[in-house]
Interface confidence: low
């Protein structure tokens, strides 16, 4: 089979027939050097998954539950292309599983025990697997058989397709539990009718069900959604209040050598020629031989899944948790009102050493997880492998887009009630050598630049945002002659000045010597023309305050700031000569860990914060010899956010807008993946 062949896996005679037709029609429209289709027939989806893993086939389209199976070892498949529904302009690749209740019913998600429940059907995603998976650890023991545990949890249910003889409580609200539309409470609309009629207290459906059944907004306003954080929201706020976000139908391939680009090329060309309303003789999204063959008949087209997205990220933390609970049936030993250890994400070797020291000193309250880049850390927090880390504002933005929330802010100024008063922020500055007297903000083109890292606030988002407004393109590697911006593409001119050795060159972690505030300033000292850092960086690394050989003899007076009006000022005049005010670094976590991270970190800073006077013999949370490990070294305390508890509110409208503008220039594969899940 030539290399440009995609071997599609079919699971029935009808699918195999459609696959052959797909193959023949593609041959007629695609040049001979383009992608082609071959068909492989297997008995089931699980057999297809195994065949792809074994390199006997390349692709198959799966429902969300099977995407989870495909991801599990030893299969290790990943999503590569998503079907979308609705219009090309507003493509829907996911639906939201929600818990709908009547407005005046007055209970929350953690108070469902003893209520009456309406389900779309036993074993169905939104109506059963997701809600029951998420409630699994609240079900009374023994939790097997599952139907019995559910029957004992709710005071009565309608769960179509359940066995009414063995589990009569599951059919209490719909006698007989009929498994078709003959049962008025079957399916999405049926489960909603069960709630509407007053038979049940809660209906587990998908977000569109309410809109499909109630055209009138005034009628919809009589209902609310239960959120996982034990609040309620209006039914149109399903994106912020759901049980899980579920992909509809997805093409999977091998994670390694999986031909994902070829599969996309094939399907993209296929939708051009044979998509909705394109061709009479062959249609990708319908078939005379049966329903939903190879692809869903209701699909309108395909979207490429961003390459950074593995199955865990694609399915989402809530969905994976629900399905894992159902499949594995394991629940934590700790009582639910007690906090489990917080798993801190540490970047590379240096942070891990400090984190391990913290872990030992915390006596089991902190555990450590390692990752090579900040984005890898954010991904680990998203999928539950880690719980928290402190981030620069640029990454708070990405984390926020990925569904994480800020919990505490680093404060850098000593004050009486430090923990109660989050600060307005710090200043992002452009530093130059005093000796380069002709250099101004207006003539930086062609100069050598030093950045903390791509995507960070003072080192990238603020200066590059301002620059973008001036040059109106993203080709910053053309604007500067060379530079060090850790996280850039390795062959970019913005990696040329970096000092990391081998694979560590230009890496966005401490293995790259020019990474971070101190690193960017060192880059200026040794090689560059301008460094983009925070206002405290120069004083923290001059006048003998940084004992490292490169810094120990530096004098603050030898450096100046570039002002946006084209003038220059001494370093201490940062308040009147800066690029913008930057939001302080903040600790982020998942919504479900917010309370525990807040509680444990406040305990930890009371034990190891700035009140510790001697850091030579004791562990100090906010010290690391100017390396800014885990937290910035100038942190005085971690402060409560009060009502600034979302990434937008924390960062502020102006900064969110600035980073939003730079989105056109974003090289963040994680941001691309997260905005695929939530545009």
């Amino acid at each position: 089979v030539p290399d440009k062949t995609v071997r599609w896996c079919a699971v029935s005679e009808h699918e195999a027939t459609k696959c052959q037709s797909f193959r023949d029609h593609m041959k007629s429209v695609i040049p001979s050097d383009g992608p082609s289709v071959a068909c492989v027939k297997k008995a089931s989806y699980l057999d297809c998954i195994r065949a792809i893993a074994a390199n006997e086939a390349d692709a198959v389209t799966l429902d969300a539950g099977l995407v989870y199976d495909a991801y599990l070892a030893p299969n290790n498949l990943k999503p590569v292309v998503a079907e979308f529904y609705g219009s090309k302009e507003d493509p829907q690749t996911f639906y939201y599983a929600v818990a709908v209740v009547k407005k005046d019913s007055g209970f929350q998600m953690n108070q469902l025990r003893g209520k009456k429940s309406c389900h779309t059907g036993l074993g169905r995603s939104a109506g059963w697997n997701i809600p029951i998976g998420l409630l699994y650890c609240d079900l009374p023991e023994p939790r097997k058989p599952l139907e019995k545990a559910v029957a004992n949890f709710f005071s009565g249910s309608c769960a179509p397709c359940a066995d009414g003889t063995d589990f009569p409580q599951l059919c209490q609200l719909c006698p007989g539990c009929g498994c078709s539309t003959l049962n008025q409470y079957f399916g999405y609309s049926g489960a909603f009718k069960c709630l509407k009629d007053g038979a049940g207290d809660v209906a587990f459906v998908k977000h569109s069900t309410i809109f499909e059944n109630l055209a009138n907004k005034a009628d919809r306003d009589q209902y609310e959604l239960l959120c996982l954080d034990n609040t309620r929201k209006p039914v149109d706020e399903y994106k912020d209040c759901h049980l899980a976000q579920v992909p509809s139908h997805t093409v999977v391939a091998r994670s390694m050598g999986g031909k994902e680009d070829l599969i996309w090329e094939l399907l993209n060309q296929a939708q051009e020629h044979f998509g909705k309303d394109k061709s009479k003789e062959f249609q990708l999204f319908s078939s005379p031989h049966g329903k939903d063959l190879l692809f869903k008949d209701s699909a309108h087209g395909f979207l490429k899944v961003p390459p950074r997205m593995d199955a865990k990220m694609y399915l989402g933390y809530e969905y994976v948790t629900a399905i894992r609970n159902l499949r594995e049936g394991t629940c934590p030993e700790a009582p639910t009102d007690e906090c489990k250890p917080v798993k801190w994400c540490a970047l590379s070797h240096h942070e891990r050493l400090k984190c391990d020291e913290w872990s030992v000193n915390s006596v089991g309250k902190i555990e450590c997880v390692s990752a090579e880049t900040t984005e890898d850390c954010i991904a680990k927090i998203m999928n539950g492998e880690a719980d928290a880390m402190s981030l620069d504002g640029g990454f708070v933005y990405i984390a926020g887009k990925c569904g994480l929330v800020p919990v505490l802010a680093e404060n850098y100024n000593k004050s009486d009630n430090c923990e109660d008063t989050p600060e307005a922020g710090y200043f992002a500055i452009a530093v130059v050598k005093k000796s380069a007297s002709d250099l101004t903000w207006d003539n930086l083109k062609g100069k050598k630049s030093c950045h903390t890292a791509v995507g960070r606030t003072a080192g990238w988002n603020i200066p590059m945002g301002l620059l973008y407004n001036k040059i109106n393109h993203c080709r910053f590697d053309e604007f500067f002659s060379e530079g060090c911006a850790p996280g850039s593409k390795k062959d970019s001119s913005l990696c040329k000045l970096c000092m990391g050795s081998g694979l560590n060159l230009c890496e966005p972690n401490n293995k790259e010597g020019y990474y971070g505030y101190t690193g960017a300033f060192r880059c200026l000292v040794e090689k560059g023309d301008v460094a983009f850092v925070k206002h405290q960086t120069v004083p923290q690394n001059t006048g003998g305050k940084n004992p490292d050989p490169w810094a120990k003899n530096l004098n603050e007076k030898d450096y100046e700031l570039l002002c946006l009006d084209g003038t220059r000022k001494p370093v201490e005049e940062y308040a009147n000569c800066h690029l913008a005010r930057a939001p302080n670094h903040a600790v982020v976590t998942r919504k479900d860990k917010e309370a525990c991270v807040h509680k444990i970190l406040r305990q930890q800073q009371h034990l190891f914060g700035s009140n510790v006077t001697d850091c030579s013999g004791n562990f100090c949370l906010f010290r690391s010899e100017t390396k800014d490990l885990l937290f910035r070294d100038d942190t005085v305390c971690l402060a409560k956010l009060h009502d600034r508890n979302t990434y937008e509110k924390y960062l502020g409208e102006e900064y969110v807008k600035a980073v939003g503008n730079l989105r056109k220039c974003s090289t963040s594969s994680l941001l691309e993946a997260c905005t695929f899940r939530r545009p």
Partner: antibody, heavy 120, light 113 residues
Framework: SVQLQESGPDLVKPSQSLSLTCTVT?????????WHWIRQFPENKLEWLGY???????NYSPSLKSRFSITRDTSKNQFFLQLNSVTTEDTATYYC?????????????WGQGTTVTVSS | VIELTQSPSSLAVSVGEKVTMTCKSS????????????LAWYQQKPGQSPKLLIY???TRESGVPDRFTGSGSGTDFTLTISSVKAEDLSVYYC?????????FGSGTKLEIK
């Protein structure tokens, strides 16, 4: 599907201000993309005027910056062009358009255009 | 400001003929980092607004017939219609989006004999 519709006066006197509205249906202007104004002179020459991004950020053609602004009303899903101190040189068909995000500035949806004559 | 020069300014062809029009840029529109040419082609039929045909110099917009082909790199670009149909009677414009502000060519008017 996405549709854009321009509206505004057909005739404006010199030195007055010109205000045009673009009403977008089928897509929220805060959800993504940049939303542009372009004009076409009677001799068919096309000139890009500026855009407002979904985030609210604006960008204008340097030749018109001083007498030109683009604003929006997100509740009505509309964006606006205001051109001050018009002269007969501003007689043109004015189009609103959306860019394809990738690539930026390549307009994949256009309104049908509204013709404005500047004359006393 | 980048200037785009289109030629010819007009041409008349018979249905079924192949037609080629060119667009020259005053500076290169090729960005070395991603090897993409920042050029688009539009078709404007009489009394209608422009319609995007080609972007990145050679990528056809969804729904555009494959008789339209964009080619070229750097400063010289070509739009080819392999077999002209009567409905192709239009003015064709090139547009650069490499450098701010984006600019358009003066157009090539295609007439049918």
């Amino acid at each position: 599907s996405v549709q854009l519709q321009e509206s505004g006066p057909d005739l404006v006197k010199p030195s007055q201000s010109l205000s045009l509205t673009c009403t977008v249906t089928g897509y929220s202007i805060t959800s993504g993309y940049s939303w542009h104004w372009i004009r076409q002179f009677p001799e068919n020459k096309l000139e890009w005027l500026g855009y407002i991004h979904s985030s609210g950020a604006t960008n204008y053609s340097p030749s018109l910056k001083s007498r030109f602004s683009i604003t929006r009303d997100t509740s009505k899903n509309q964006f606006f062009l205001q051109l001050n101190s018009v002269t007969t040189e501003d007689t043109a068909t004015y189009y609103c358009a959306r860019d394809g995000y990738s690539p930026p500035y390549a307009m994949d949806y256009w309104g049908q255009g509204t013709t404005v004559t500047v004359s006393s | 400001v980048i200037e785009l020069t289109q030629s010819p300014s007009s041409l008349a062809v018979s249905v079924g003929e192949k037609v080629t029009m060119t667009c020259k840029s005053s500076q290169s529109l090729l960005y070395s980092t991603n090897q993409k040419n920042y050029l688009a082609w539009y078709q404007q039929k009489p009394g209608q607004s422009p319609k995007l045909l080609i972007y990145w110099a050679s990528t056809r917009e969804s729904g555009v017939p494959d008789r339209f082909t964009g080619s070229g790199s750097g400063t010289d670009f070509t739009l080819t219609i392999s077999s002209v149909k009567a409905e192709d009677l239009s003015v064709y414009y090139c547009q650069q989006y490499y450098s701010y502000p984006p600019t358009f060519g003066s157009g090539t008017k295609l007439e049918i004999k």
